[in-house]
Structures are given as structure tokens and as C-alpha cells.
Interface confidence: low
């Protein structure tokens, strides 16, 4: 029988390169069986992860998995950094791997970002 543990499917070392001024949705894929867990986003500041309590979030449900979304409307230069989602489930805290946003400030970008491959390892953000 498949495990009914809550799982957060953010693949480690995941990254997003995004432009300041654009809208963006950061997704935390969550697998659960019965009751949906309480999920929060936090932003890493050194070794601590600061909870993002005043940000717009929403849920998107799909057949096999759900997504807890952190909305950036729009992306700001200081949104650059690493984020983590956490789920509270039956008094257990489950933390995802961190995902990093690289924000390019359009005003300072003289050209489009390079389309050269950045990773030799085949990391994918989520499945």
C-alpha cells in the first residue's frame, strides 16, 4: 500500500531565473491522502527561515498532487533568494528542499539572459 505520509516534492538544488516586474507563482507540490496539511512558505535568511505571513498564497488541486502557491505580483528585485515550504501534519513538521529565485532587474539587464545550459546535472524543479 502506498504511503500516506505528507510529502513535499521540491527537488533539491532547484532554481528559477525570473524577471523583476513579471508575475510569478512559486509552487510547492504537496502529496497527502486525507486531510490537507497546513503549509507555509518561508524565505531563508542565513541559517533561519523567515515565515512569509503577509504574502498571497493559494492552493491548486490536481489529480495526483496539490500545489501550495506563493504569488509574486509582481516580482521585486529583493525577492531574490532561497525559499522553503513546510507542512504541519499531525504535529509533525515536514520541510522541503529550498528553491532559489534568481531575480534579474530589467532596468539593469542590458541583454536577454543567456540560453546556455547552466547545469550539467539534470535537476528539475518539480515533477
Amino acid at each position: 500500500k502506498e504511503s500516506c505520509d505528507v510529502q513535499l516534492y521540491i527537488k533539491r538544488q532547484s532554481e528559477h531565473s525570473i524577471l523583476a516586474g513579471d508575475p510569478f507563482e512559486l509552487e510547492c507540490p504537496v502529496k497527502y491522502c486525507a486531510n490537507r496539511p497546513h503549509v507555509t512558505w518561508c524565505k531563508l535568511n542565513g541559517t533561519t527561515c523567515v515565515k512569509l505571513e503577509d504574502r498571497q498564497t493559494s492552493w491548486k488541486e490536481e489529480k495526483n498532487i496539490s500545489f501550495f502557491i506563493l504569488h509574486f505580483e509582481p516580482v521585486l528585485p529583493n525577492d531574490n533568494g532561497s525559499y522553503r515550504c513546510s507542512a504541519n501534519f499531525q504535529s509533525n513538521l515536514i520541510e522541503s528542499h529550498s528553491t532559489t529565485l534568481y531575480v534579474t532587474d530589467v532596468k539593469s539587464a542590458s541583454e536577454r539572459p543567456s540560453k546556455d545550459e547552466m547545469a550539467s546535472r539534470p535537476w528539475l524543479l518539480y515533477r
Epitope: 516534492y9 532554481e15 531565473s17 525570473i18 507540490p29 495526483n64 547552466m118 524543479l125
Partner: antibody, heavy 127, light 108 residues
Framework: QVQLVESGGGVVQPGRSLRLSCEAS????????MNWVRQAPGKGLEWVAV????????YFADSVKGRFTISRDNSKNTLYLQMNSLRAEDTAVYYC????????????????????WGQGTTVTVSS | EIVLTQFPGTLSLSPGERATLSCRAS???????LAWYQQKPGQAPRLLIY???SRATGIPDRFSGSGSGTDFTLTISRLEPEDFAVYYC?????????FGQGTRLEIK
Amino acid sequence: QVQLVESGGGVVQPGRSLRLSCEASGFTFNNYDMNWVRQAPGKGLEWVAVIWNDGSNKYFADSVKGRFTISRDNSKNTLYLQMNSLRAEDTAVYYCAREVFTMVRGIIITYYGMDVWGQGTTVTVSS
Amino acid sequence: EIVLTQFPGTLSLSPGERATLSCRASQSVSSSYLAWYQQKPGQAPRLLIYGASSRATGIPDRFSGSGSGTDFTLTISRLEPEDFAVYYCQQYGRSIITFGQGTRLEIK
């Protein structure tokens, strides 16, 4: 050269079990997510299961969920498919396939598809 | 689950002709996540196109892919005898991978 070799197929009675193996060579196995894909006689391709490069996450097609288990031993460069409670409709050629994706700086995550396939191993479920 | 429907089911053409194979998704698919494969009898599938339009290593330039959203196309500009095979489209989903049912390209 880059190669995948499946083994373990054969004729088995309904309700019985079988374990398929896929031995990888010529590439760094633990860098890649791996899939099993099957093809029933005269039919099309059906994705069966995937396992992340480090074995941390696994996904299954609805048709095999709860009956099949995917695993890997990165120290042996080997992928496995444990098939339990086999049914006549599981009769097929089973292929293992390497899946490749990479991050591209220009906001694009490129999915390269399944670029390396084994030759397949035949599983026949019959009484 | 995204369903991929390929048409026509069978395409009968002669060497030298142009082949156009279609793949329609039941909902929008990122073009970055769409691939095409070729399979000949008794052989494993072979990756042809990834990212809807990029040729895989070693694939001749007579093969090209296009499309976005729900409609994707594989074009073989001038058919060679070795191109007669079954072609599959495939999409990469967050938790599920799906293939189309295939288009058989046969010699007329």
C-alpha cells in the same frame, strides 16, 4: 558507450511476482531519473513508473499503482521494477529509459526526454 | 491526466514525400515538455525531438517539430525509406508522463 540492459522477463502465472532489472553503463547513473515504459503486443507505449536520481521520490501509472514498486541501487548502477499481483494485461515488453532535463538560465527548464532506452525484456502473464 | 491524441492513426506516403504528423493534448502543455519518438518493429523507441522543436543528437534535419499549447506537429520534409515506422508524442507532467497512441507511417 551509454547503454541500458534489461533482464528478468519471462512467463509467469496471474497473481505471481516478477522482478525486472536494468543495468546501466557508460554514464553517471546517479545523475539521472529513470523510467520504466512498457508496450503490450501490437499496442503503443505506456509509461509505468519513474524514480528520481537519488531514489527519494517515485511515481507510478494508475494501472500499476499499489502492485508495482520501482527502486534503484546507485552503487550497482541498477534499476529495478518489482511487479506483484501480475495480471494478463501486464503482458508487454518492458523498457527502462533514462530521462534528461536541465536548467537553462533564460527562465526555461528544458526537458530532453528519454534519450537512452534498453532493448526491452518480455513479460508474459498467462495461466 | 493530460491525454495526447495523435492523428492520423496511419499515414500512407511514398519516399520523397512530406509527412505531417499531429499530436493534440487534452489541455495545454508547455512546449518545453513535449517530445517525439520513432519506433521501428522489434526495436526500442528512439528520441527524435525534445522541447517540441529541438532535434535530438544525431537526428537528420529533415525531421522538425513545431507547435504550442495543445497542438503539436512532427514534420518529415522528404521521406527516406528508413523513416517508415511508428511515431509517438510524449509529454512530461509533474507527476505523470503520457504518450500518444502513435501514428504508423507506412509506404504507399
